[in-house]
């Protein structure tokens, strides 16, 4: 990778081990936990990142800082099974043979069952709503400036094309970023909205996944945009299948 011709590191994923053992002595990086080769010009899949996070030695792991506002997927962190492309396998099981089905962002979408549970396909999360509340500012941000800045951020930092940022809504102090992406809309090289949302979530929490890059410094016309809470909602192409018991 150019990634770091000189010191051989992965700019888009610090949870990697890199060495100049690629073709022609080029830098090649592998994700911790899975050992899978990653492309350091783009985001690493959320599945491989979760796997790396779970495999990191306890004392080196950067745990999520507990916060009453932080919404983790209700089941919290787990060590996922990833397919050869780094995507979540449709069925996930823990060490005690409890299994469940997940969507493309790794969030549970069925009740938990046993090893007989079948998950026929990986259901795509095609709509992600990122709900942010920003800290008080002197005045409200200009909506169009905010929209432009967030689109620029998602393109430059997360490599997500603006076509997938469906809308930016703003009613001070709440900002909502809508990401939409059907399977058929993704062209070669397009970043997955689930991966972009995960990198953004980690950036907002001050747990950047980028190597040696400063933390997220969001500014709208020079005014700092500081987020005090984040909620992320995932909508799947096929609605989830939970029993009525859970819904009550």
């Amino acid at each position: 990778h150019t990634a770091a011709q000189d010191n051989c590191t992965c700019p888009t994923n610090k949870m990697t081990v890199c060495s100049p053992d690629g073709p022609g002595g080029r830098c090649q990086c592998r994700a911790l936990g899975s050992g899978m080769a990653v492309d350091c010009s783009t985001l690493t899949s959320k599945c491989l990142l979760l796997k790396a996070r779970m495999s990191a030695p306890k004392n080196a792991r950067t745990l999520v800082r507990p916060s009453e506002h932080a919404l983790v997927d209700n089941d919290g962190l787990y060590d996922p099974d990833c397919d050869p492309e780094g995507r979540f396998k449709a069925r996930q099981c823990n060490q005690t043979s409890v299994c469940w089905c997940v969507n493309s962002v790794g969030v549970r979408r069925t009740d938990k069952g046993d090893l007989s549970l079948r998950c026929d396909e990986l259901v795509r999360t095609h709509h992600i709503l990122i709900d942010l509340r920003h800290r008080p500012t002197a005045g409200a941000f200009n909506h169009s400036d905010l929209d432009a800045e967030l689109r620029r951020l998602f393109r430059e930092r997360y490599r997500l094309h603006p076509k997938f940022v469906a809308a930016v809504h703003y009613e001070q102090p709440t900002i909502q970023i809508e990401l939409r992406q059907n399977t058929s809309q993704k062209a070669a090289g397009d970043v997955d909205i689930g991966d972009a949302a995960y990198y953004f979530e980690r950036d907002i929490k001050g747990e950047s996944l980028f190597q040696g890059r400063g933390g997220l410094d969001l500014r709208v016309r020079g005014e700092p945009l500081q987020v005090e809470r984040t909620l992320i909602y995932y909508l799947d192409e096929i609605p989830p299948k939970f029993s009525m018991k859970r819904l009550t």
């Epitope: 620029r152 076509k163 059907n182 058929s184 070669a188 090289g189 397009d190």
Partner: antibody
Framework: QVQLVQSGAEVKKPGASVKVSCKAS????????MHWVRQAPGQGLEWMGE????????SYNQKFKGRVTITRDTSTSTAYMELSSLRSEDTAVYYC????????????WGQGTLVTVSS | DIQMTQSPSSLSASVGDRVTITCRAS??????LNWYQQKPGKAPKLLIY???RLHSGVPSRFSGSGSGTDFTLTISSLQPEDFATYFC??????????FGQGTKLEIK
């Protein structure tokens, strides 16, 4: 192998419109971005706009202020670029080029279509 | 828009020479820099993408380096077929994607 074949040269009068076609083969048309780039005689390259053939999403270089329209026909794996209100400065070779979503590199190009605008 | 500036705008060299062309971006573009070769009357051809990755079929005498705002295309040993015009292009930010003005490489 990947091929992009463009329509032939055109001569147009100022104020008219031109529509250039680009037929793709050798790959799945809907799986790659398609871009249009032009080059005036003896000049550099200028990006005009892009389309995702799968859903028809487009974005354009604001320089062209609504004069450019990019469309596609997935049944024939063909992309089109229409430029309206032509002026003499639009005389150029127009290229279609297949693009990558992350690098935004143009890995395969059409042979080019010369559009001459002259009264 | 991000401006891309190439230097030199033209240069003369001989077969076997080592040649370097530089490209400077008006702001940080990380590594999202691509290089193209164009011969008279022909369409451009992609040589290098993402600063240093060789496009398929491109000879290994071509190499690229750089990061941020300053980038370099190097031809280690010029061959007769390398005399052409070279363009850099950034794919970092929101459209429009921009090209350098070109560097014409001529036979000395």
């Amino acid at each position: 192998q990947v091929q992009l074949v463009q329509s032939g040269a055109e001569v147009k009068k100022p104020g008219a419109s031109v529509k250039v076609s680009c037929k793709a083969s050798g790959y799945t048309f809907t799986s790659y971005w398609m871009h249009w780039v032009r080059q005036a005689p003896g000049q550099g390259l200028e990006w005009m706009g892009e389309i995702t053939p799968s859903d028809g999403y487009t974005s354009y270089n604001q320089k062209f202020k609504g004069r450019v329209t990019i469309t596609r026909d997935t049944s024939t794996s063909t992309a089109y670029m229409e430029l309206s209100s032509l002026r003499s400065e639009d005389t150029a070779v127009y290229y279609c080029a297949r693009g990558h979503g992350n690098y935004v590199s143009f890995d395969y190009w059409g042979q080019g279509t010369l559009v001459t605008v002259s009264s | 828009d991000i401006q891309m500036t190439q230097s030199p705008s033209s240069l003369s060299a001989s077969v076997g020479d080592r040649v370097t062309i530089t490209c400077r971006a008006s702001q940080d573009i990380s590594n999202y820099l691509n290089w193209y070769q164009q011969k008279p009357g022909k369409a451009p051809k992609l040589l290098i993408y993402y600063t240093s990755r060789l496009h398929s079929g491109v000879p290994s005498r071509f190499s690229g380096s750089g990061s941020g705002t300053d980038f370099t295309l190097t031809i280690s040993s010029l061959q007769p077929e390398d005399f052409a015009t070279y363009f850099c292009q950034q794919g970092y930010t929101l459209p429009p994607y921009t090209f350098g003005q070109g560097t014409k490489l001529e036979i000395k």
